[in-house]
């Protein structure tokens, strides 16, 4: 699986999940989110080639059209498989609130 | 919705489904696929930014930092929503069989 | 919150060594890939050199391969960069950054370590 476990100790080229820390101020200038202050959201990037993880029957197709006509630019994406939430404080006015907000870090990629 | 009856119409330049025929035998080698002799598969391209289609949360949030950090590298990529399969024709020995391949066409995109 | 404070910079002469740290927290460190990254004078952040979660693979930038090592102490939460045979143009404040800085251009979060090469 293309996983963190995976990705982060292999440093694979082709796709994977990357790490991405985020800081809500800095990053996207959340200022309303009073804890955590940032997250590993992670990314997934890196070439899809023929057979890479296909996530259907059409990203396999594609993969080997991709690879037999290279110059076609068609090929399939690095994206997000599994992602959990992540629970967040935030402040109502003086009220504290928490909420957690699905799919916010993703643990696994596919080529889709 | 970034499906084939938009896309096809209005040649977006952001993510949406393409139009791309594939034949069997040209472009994959598959001389076992007797009918049809090729299908429209499409594939989906294009630019992810901030809001567009946003699958989840992390691709909004990852649209948000792409935009706000542009030199970063990580943003949302278009990839197929949904699709539809593909009924076709084989021969075994001289027995033809008729079999529904799942998943083969894309019909809409997304941005992950 | 994440923080990541760099040490050992210095004025060295050229062929000299030096050994940069920085010491992680907030994260879990040993789950991460780290990398180090570097900004010379007037320059945009140049990747140097990334290491793997459990510090088994790592790669640099052709610039510094064969001069440099990175390691790691998971341990310690601390990443190391031994940088041998330097040369001028390794002239440059060094930072540290979380992630695989191959693929993402890291805000810097540290204060970085100057490092000057000159005789």
């Known amino acids: 699986a293309l996983d963190t476990n995976y990705c982060f100790r292999n440093l694979e080229e082709n796709c994977c999940v990357r790490p991405l820390y985020i800081d809500f101020r800095q990053d996207l200038g959340w200022k309303w989110v009073h804890e955590p202050k940032g997250y590993y959201a992670n990314f997934c990037s890196g070439p899809c080639p023929y057979l890479r993880s296909a996530d259907t029957t059409h990203s396999t197709v594609l993969g080997l059209y991709n690879t037999l006509n290279p110059e076609a630019s068609a090929s399939p994406c690095c994206v997000p498989q599994d992602l959990e939430p992540l629970t967040i404080l935030y402040y109502v006015g003086r009220t504290p609130k928490v909420e957690q907000l699905s799919n916010m870090v993703v643990k696994s990629c596919k080529c889709s | 919705a970034l499906d084939t009856n938009y896309c096809f119409r209005n040649l977006e330049e952001n993510c949406c489904v393409r139009p791309l025929y594939i034949d069997f035998r040209q472009d994959l080698g598959w001389k076992w696929v007797h009918e049809p002799k090729g299908y429209y598969a499409n594939f989906c391209s294009g630019p992810c930014p901030y809001l567009r289609s946003a699958d989840t949360t992390h691709s909004t949030v990852l649209g948000l930092y792409n935009t706000l950090n542009p030199e970063a590298s990580a943003s949302p990529c278009c990839v197929p929503q949904d699709l539809e399969p593909l009924t076709i024709l084989y021969y075994v020995g001289r027995t033809p069989k008729v079999e529904q391949l799942s998943n083969m066409v894309v019909k809409s995109c997304k941005c992950s | 919150q994440l923080q990541l404070v760099e040490s050992g910079g210095g004025l060295v002469q050229p062929g000299g060594s030096l050994t940069l740290s920085c010491l992680a927290s907030?994260?879990?460190?040993?789950?991460?890939?780290m990398s180090w990254v570097r900004q010379a004078p007037g320059k945009g952040l140049e990747w140097v050199s990334v290491i793997g979660s459990d510090g088994a693979i790592k790669h640099y930038s052709d610039s510094v391969k064969g001069r440099f090592a990175i390691s790691r102490d998971n341990a310690k939460n601390t990443l190391y960069l031994q940088m041998n045979s330097l040369k001028p143009e390794d002239t440059a404040v060094y930072y540290c950054?979380?992630?695989?800085?191959?693929?993402?251009?890291?805000?810097?979060r540290g204060q970085g370590t100057q490092v000057t090469v000159s005789s």
């Open positions: 907030g994260f879990t460190f040993s789950h991460y890939p």
């Open positions: 950054a979380e992630g695989d800085s191959r693929y993402v251009r890291n805000r810097a």
